[in-house]
Interface confidence: low
């Protein structure tokens, strides 16, 4: 189920799967929610620790049991991922942090009149992930009203420093507020060039596009279909970026499909989940559990309810079925995508719906004259 | 909203505009999306206009002037007014609207979390009221959704300011001693939300007040936590399962 309570002055021991710098616990929680394996997180505010390297530290954690021992740590904040929390799942983070400088690669500097305008510039720049703004009262006059647009390899700051008269925040592209607009087109038999930022296996180009949309550095992608000539590259989804933000070249290539991240779409973003079920396909991965259920939809529901389950395969082989029920293989991987995709099998596969934000599986723990 | 500022897209994605289509179409009240098919609002919005057909509910919008004849809207399947609400009084000013068709959630249209039943222990320090209502007592409906940050006031303090009325434990008040910031006409039924531990919760429903933003006359809101049993009962009995965001 959905657990939203935060634990003050508590730190989860062990289970680390990733760490990064975030300005507050809520942003840390959001990163945990979108991380394929993170179930728990612990955050160390600047006030909670003297070690400069660990200040603003966000530690993403996994646990086979779904819980970890809590140790007392003054000022620390811990909590759960919001996977399975329905509409609360959002990559949108509007907060602006005063007195904080989020470090990264500064790729653009301009003078603006307010922090809101700086955030708007970041939101309207295809490469900007976060920004810092030096206010009118910044100690160095030449830097006053400077708006620094930034990015980093992981999409989070490479460091966060306490600095007076500086305000920082994140791009509002995940809030569907970008003025850039997006390319919805999918280009058949076309391969994009440029830098690969990640490689995952997906059953189709649409899953590839959604993964690209929620990857911090993916601007466009190329997907190699299951009939691509090189067997080892079949179902490969290459997430890509470039200096300019668009592909520098594209090559006509049979059995490839290319397209763009939808992060810059105005007013609507795809859900960060994949609801389609793929008949005759087997998703390989680490076995989490095997259970007998009646029908592929129940298998998907079972996967969705088991928070660590990322994807599943429902077998229809005679030896895997008893009466009306067949084996439902609940699986996971390091990156949330299948480690292998096989075709022509007796069964169907699909993904957990734990990150779908349309479910009702959500729990919130939110005069004389009428008006 | 008096003393407020313009909201931005998706800032209050649960806010809806309840509009009436008679000879003309006008915004009458606000409301809060609490589930795919449920809106929470004030009972007094339906006084004398309880017919479902005349109402149009707009969600996922910021600017009322963007609404055209082609703008999609929701229609009402059922209006559930609190059984103890009386036309001539301000008590139990709460109503549920069941929409004819469920809404999909987006960044601009998603529900607000409800408080826990009888939530009295949480100290809310960051509360906002939103709406398209008047920006002054003798004003007019605003085009862009307005927001204003208002502190909660204790019921004891509120009762002192409204000696002719009974401020019950099922009401919550908010306002500045000096006035200047408040809900106003047309904000009725809309949300008073508070952020706690990084999460927004629906603490109140805009109900009434003496004028708008007057000195020492706080706004009075229906306290949602006091009606959680009623909300759960109505939303569950309607179709067998809870269709709104229930508390932990």
């Amino acid at each position: 189920g959905c657990l939203t309570q935060l634990y003050e002055n508590a730190f989860f021991r062990g289970g680390d799967v990733a760490s990064m710098y975030t300005p507050n616990a809520q942003y840390c929680q959001m990163r945990c929610t979108f991380h394929p394996r993170c179930l728990l997180f612990s955050f160390l505010p600047a006030s909670s620790i003297n070690d400069m390297e660990k200040r603003f530290g966000c530690f993403l954690k996994d646990s086979v049991t779904g819980t970890l021992p809590k140790v007392h740590r003054t000022g620390a904040v811990s909590g759960h991922s919001l996977k399975q929390c329905g509409h609360q799942i959002s990559a949108c983070h509007r907060d602006i942090y005063k007195g904080v400088d989020m470090r990264g690669v500064n790729f653009n500097v301009s003078k603006v009149s307010s922090v809101e305008e700086c955030q708007k510039r970041c939101t309207s720049n295809i490469r900007c992930q976060f920004f810092s703004y030096a206010t009118q009262t910044f100690h160095k006059a030449e830097y006053r009203n400077n708006c620094l647009l930034k990015y980093s390899p992981g999409g989070t700051p490479t460091a966060i420093k306490v600095l007076s008269n500086v305000e920082s925040g994140f791009s509002l592209k995940p809030c569907a507020l970008s003025e850039i607009g997006c390319h919805m087109n999918i280009f058949q038999h076309l391969a994009f060039s440029d830098v690969d930022v990640a490689r995952v296996l997906t059953p189709d180009a649409f899953v590839c596009r959604t993964i690209c949309t929620y990857h911090p550095n993916c601007l466009f992608f190329t997907f190699y279909t299951n009939v691509w000539k090189i067997e080892s590259q079949r179902n490969v989804c290459l997430l890509k970026t470039s200096e300019s933000g668009t592909p520098s070249s594209s090559t006509p290539q049979e059995n490839t499909i290319s397209g763009y991240s939808l992060l810059t779409c105005k007013r609507t973003l795809p859900e960060p989940c994949h609801s389609k079920i793929y008949p005759g396909v087997d998703f390989g991965g680490e076995e989490l559990n095997v259970t007998f259920v009646k029908g592929v939809n129940v298998c998907q529901e079972t996967c969705t309810k088991m928070i660590r389950c990322q994807f599943f395969t429902y077998s229809l082989l005679p030896e895997d079925c008893k009466e009306e029920k067949c084996k439902c293989f609940l699986r996971l991987s390091m990156d949330g995508s299948p480690t292998r995709i096989a075709y022509g099998t007796q069964g169907s596969s699909g993904y957990s719906l734990r990150l779908c934000n349309t479910g009702d599986n959500s729990v919130c723990t939110t005069k004389t004259s009428t008006r | 909203i008096v003393g407020g500022t313009n909201s931005s897209w998706g800032e209050w994605p649960w806010q809806v505009s309840l509009q009436v289509k008679l000879t003309a179409q006008r915004h009458l009240c606000g409301g809060s999306l609490i589930g795919h098919q449920w809106v929470l609002t004030a009972a007094h919005c339906f006084d004398g206009l309880p017919l479902q057909d005349v109402w149009r509910i707009y969600s996922g919008i910021l600017n009322l002037s963007d609404i055209t004849k082609d703008t999609p809207f929701s229609q009402i399947k059922e209006i559930i007014i609190h059984q103890n609400y009386k036309v001539s009084e301000g008590n139990h000013d709460i109503a549920l609207i069941k929409l004819q068709a469920p809404l999909n959630y987006t960044e601009f249209q998603k529900p607000i979390c409800l408080p826990s039943k009888g939530d009295t222990s949480t100290i809310y320090t960051n509360c906002w009221v939103t709406g398209w209502g008047f920006s002054k007592e003798k004003g007019e409906i605003q085009n862009i959704l307005q927001k204003v940050n208002i502190p909660l006031v204790t019921n004891e303090e509120c009762q002192k300011r409204y000696q002719d009325y009974k401020i019950t434990q099922r009401m919550v008040c908010a306002g500045y001693k000096e006035g200047g910031k408040d809900a106003c006409k047309g904000d009725s039924g809309g949300p008073l939300v508070c952020k706690h531990n990084g999460m927004w919760r629906l603490v109140g429903i805009t109900s009434w007040g003496e004028g708008c933003a007057r000195r020492e006359q706080p706004g009075v809101y229906t306290k949602v936590a006091e009606y959680m049993d009623w909300i759960l009962e109505k939303t569950q009995s309607s179709d067998g399962k809870a269709q709104m965001q229930s508390p932990a």
Epitope: T370 | G48, V87
Partner: antibody, heavy 122, light 106 residues
Framework: EVQLLESGGGLVQPGGSLRLSCAAS????????MMWVRQAPGKGLEWVSG????????VYADSVKGRFTISRDNSKNTLYLQMNSLRAEDTAVYYC???????????????WGQGTMVTVSS | DIQMTQSPSTLSASVGDRVTITCRAS??????LAWYQQKPGKAPNLLIY???TLESGVPSRFSGSGSGTEFTLTISSLQPDDFATYYC????????FGQGTKVEIK
Amino acid sequence: EVQLLESGGGLVQPGGSLRLSCAASGFTFSHYIMMWVRQAPGKGLEWVSGIYSSGGITVYADSVKGRFTISRDNSKNTLYLQMNSLRAEDTAVYYCAYRRTGIPRWDAFDIWGQGTMVTVSS
Amino acid sequence: DIQMTQSPSTLSASVGDRVTITCRASQSISSWLAWYQQKPGKAPNLLIYKASTLESGVPSRFSGSGSGTEFTLTISSLQPDDFATYYCQQYNTYWTFGQGTKVEIK
């Protein structure tokens, strides 16, 4: 004391126009939904038109739609009824009315003016 | 439009009588119904609203009941001051009055 005082009635020829006024006092006029109701001689009551407290919403009976216009000036505490294309069947006493609850709403009417007579005749 | 039908049109009664007037709506109006009393040359006077709620200052001998489409006004013991015309009014959708019931001395 709460009071509604209608004026502007009189004799008018068919097809003519007339503007009725209703001066309100003793209450916060701008908070309330106001109505016009008429009563033909020896006949029953007929609701004519209503206006929301801000003036934003106006509603009319089918019998007067397109001919009558209700309006209000909250700064003057006055309600108006502009009557055009008058017919013999519009002959009636015209009352303005409202509901004196602390809450503006579409409702029954508990406060009525004394009425003003409109006669449409050639 | 919602039509309101009152019966009877005229009712002859004596002081002390129990008097009942009925009002039927052409479609359901929930409890959004009011009753008025009107005397010749005077404006109507609200007696009951929301079908059964007695308006402040109205004698308790007046009572209202019903919901949906069928409504009743009852005067438990008719007084000399009660001889007048009574109107029902729906305010569910816009406003419609019944045609009136005249209560006269028998």
